[in-house]
C-alpha cells in the first residue's frame, strides 16, 4: 500500500514538475527590466527564450521573435537545449511510469518489470529536474555576471546622439517557475525510485516446513538457527533432523556385546 | 549602427504647414516610442509630439490642435505634421527613438537621437 501511494505520489508530483517546465520555458518573462518612463508612455520590457516583449502602460504589449537577431549567445542556446531536453525526458518518463503505476493491471505483466519501469521513469525524472535547474541557472548567471546593469553613453559619427537606456535586468517570474518545477521533477523522480524498492520482488522465505517421521505420526518443526547452534529454549538437545525426532532420552538402544559381560 | 535622420525641414511662412519626417535605420529590432523634440535659442530642450509603438499620443501644449504626429511601423518612420504654424515655432527639431538593437541578447535599448533640422518661421 505504502509502496503505491509512493509510486503515485511521485508520478503526480513529477507530472507537475513537468507541466511547470514547460510553462516556464515558453513563458517570456525570464528576464525583466526596470520600468522606465519615457516622456510619451511609461515602458516595461522583459524577454524570454523565445522572444522580446514591451509593454505599455495603455496596457499594449507588442512581442518580437529572436529570429531577426545577429547573433544569438552560445549560453542562451544552452538554455534552450537543457529545457528542452528537460521536457523530452520528462514526457518519457512520464510514459514509462503510466505503465509502470502498480494500480494499472496491463495484461500479464510482473512486478519486475513493473520495478525496473519504475525506476526508469525515476531515472527519467530526476536528469529532467536537473536539466530544468541547470537551465534556468545558466540563465540567472547571465544576468548576474553581463547584463545586470547598462547605462554607458556612445555617440553616432552622423551627428546624432546614441545613448543607452539605463534599464537593470532582474529575475523574470520564468526563472522561480523553473527552479521550483525542476525541484518537484527531481523529488518526483527520487519518489520513483524509492517505491521501485518496494515493488521489486523479494527472496522467498522459506518459513514453517512439516516433516513426517517414517514410522512415526510426529510432525516436527525445525527450530532454525537457534535450535540447531544449541541456542535458545532447545533444553531438550534434540537432535534436528532426526527421523524420529525423538530426544536422546527416547533413543532405542541396540544390544552391544557389552550388554551380555 | 543605428541612426535616425530627419527631414522636412525649410524656411516657412507664418500660418504655413511643414511635414518632417524621421527615419531610424540599421540593425533594428524594435521601436518603442518615437518622438520630435525642439530647441529654441538659448532653451531647453522641450518635447513636441511623441508616439509609442501601440499609438500611445502625447502633445506638447503649445502643439495641441496644430500638429499631429504618425507613424509608419513597417518603415520604422515617424512623421510631424505642422499647421498654423507661428514665429515661435522656430527651432531645430530633434527626432528621438526609444529603439532595441538586433546587435546583442539581452535585447538592449537605446535612446537615439538625430542631428536636427531647422524649421524657421518668418515673413
Known amino acids: 500500500m505504502a509502496v503505491t501511494a509512493c509510486q503515485g505520489l511521485g508520478f503526480v508530483v513529477s507530472l507537475i514538475g513537468i507541466a511547470g517546465i514547460i510553462a516556464a520555458t515558453c513563458m517570456d518573462q525570464w528576464s525583466t527590466q526596470d520600468l522606465y518612463n519615457n516622456p510619451v508612455t511609461a515602458v516595461f520590457n522583459y524577454q524570454g527564450l523565445w522572444r522580446s516583449c514591451v509593454r505599455e502602460s495603455s496596457g499594449f504589449t507588442e512581442c518580437r521573435g529572436y529570429f531577426t537577431l545577429l547573433g544569438l549567445p552560445a549560453m542562451l542556446q544552452a538554455v534552450r537545449a537543457l529545457m528542452i531536453v528537460g521536457i523530452v525526458l520528462g514526457a518519457i518518463g512520464l510514459l514509462v511510469s503510466i505503465f509502470a503505476l502498480k494500480c494499472i493491471r496491463i495484461g500479464s505483466m510482473e512486478d519486475s518489470a513493473k520495478a525496473n519501469m519504475t525506476l526508469t521513469s525515476g531515472i527519467m525524472f530526476i536528469v529532467s529536474g536537473l536539466c530544468a535547474i541547470a537551465g534556468v541557472s545558466v540563465f540567472a548567471n547571465m544576468l548576474v555576471t553581463n547584463f545586470w546593469m547598462s547605462t554607458a553613453n556612445m555617440y553616432t559619427g552622423m551627428g546624432g546622439m546614441v545613448q543607452t537606456v539605463q534599464t537593470r535586468y532582474t529575475f523574470g517570474a520564468a526563472l522561480f517557475v523553473g527552479w521550483v518545477a525542476g525541484g518537484l521533477t527531481l523529488i518526483g523522480g527520487v519518489m520513483m525510485c524509492i517505491a521501485c524498492r518496494g515493488l521489486a520482488p523479494e527472496e522467498t522465505n522459506y518459513k514453517a516446513v512439516s516433516y513426517h517421521a517414517s514410522g512415526h505420526s510426529v510432525a516436527y518443526k525445525p527450530g532454525g538457527f537457534k535450535a540447531s547452534t544449541g541456542f535458545g529454549s532447545n533444553t531438550k538437545n534434540k537432535k534436528i533432523y532426526d527421523g524420529g525426532a525423538r530426544t536422546e532420552d527416547e533413543v532405542q538402544s541396540y544390544p552391544s556385546k557389552h550388554d551380555y559381560v | 549602427e543605428v541612426q535616425v535622420v530627419e527631414s522636412g525641414g525649410g524656411l516657412v511662412q507664418p500660418g504655413g504647414s511643414l511635414r518632417l519626417s524621421c527615419a531610424a535605420s540599421g540593425s533594428i529590432f524594435s521601436i518603442n516610442v518615437m518622438g520630435w523634440y525642439r530647441q529654441a535659442p538659448g532653451k531647453q530642450r522641450e518635447l513636441v509630439a511623441g508616439?509609442?509603438?501601440?499609438?500611445?499620443?502625447r502633445y506638447a501644449d503649445s502643439a495641441k490642435g496644430r500638429f499631429t504626429i504618425s507613424r509608419d511601423n513597417a518603415k520604422n518612420t515617424v512623421y510631424l505634421q505642422m499647421n498654423s504654424l507661428k514665429p515661435e515655432d522656430t527651432a531645430v527639431y530633434y527626432c528621438n527613438a526609444d529603439l532595441a538593437t538586433a546587435t546583442s541578447w539581452p535585447v538592449r535599448y537605446l535612446e537615439v537621437w538625430g542631428q536636427g533640422t531647422l524649421v524657421t518661421v518668418s515673413a
Open positions: 508616439i509609442s509603438t501601440g499609438g500611445t499620443t
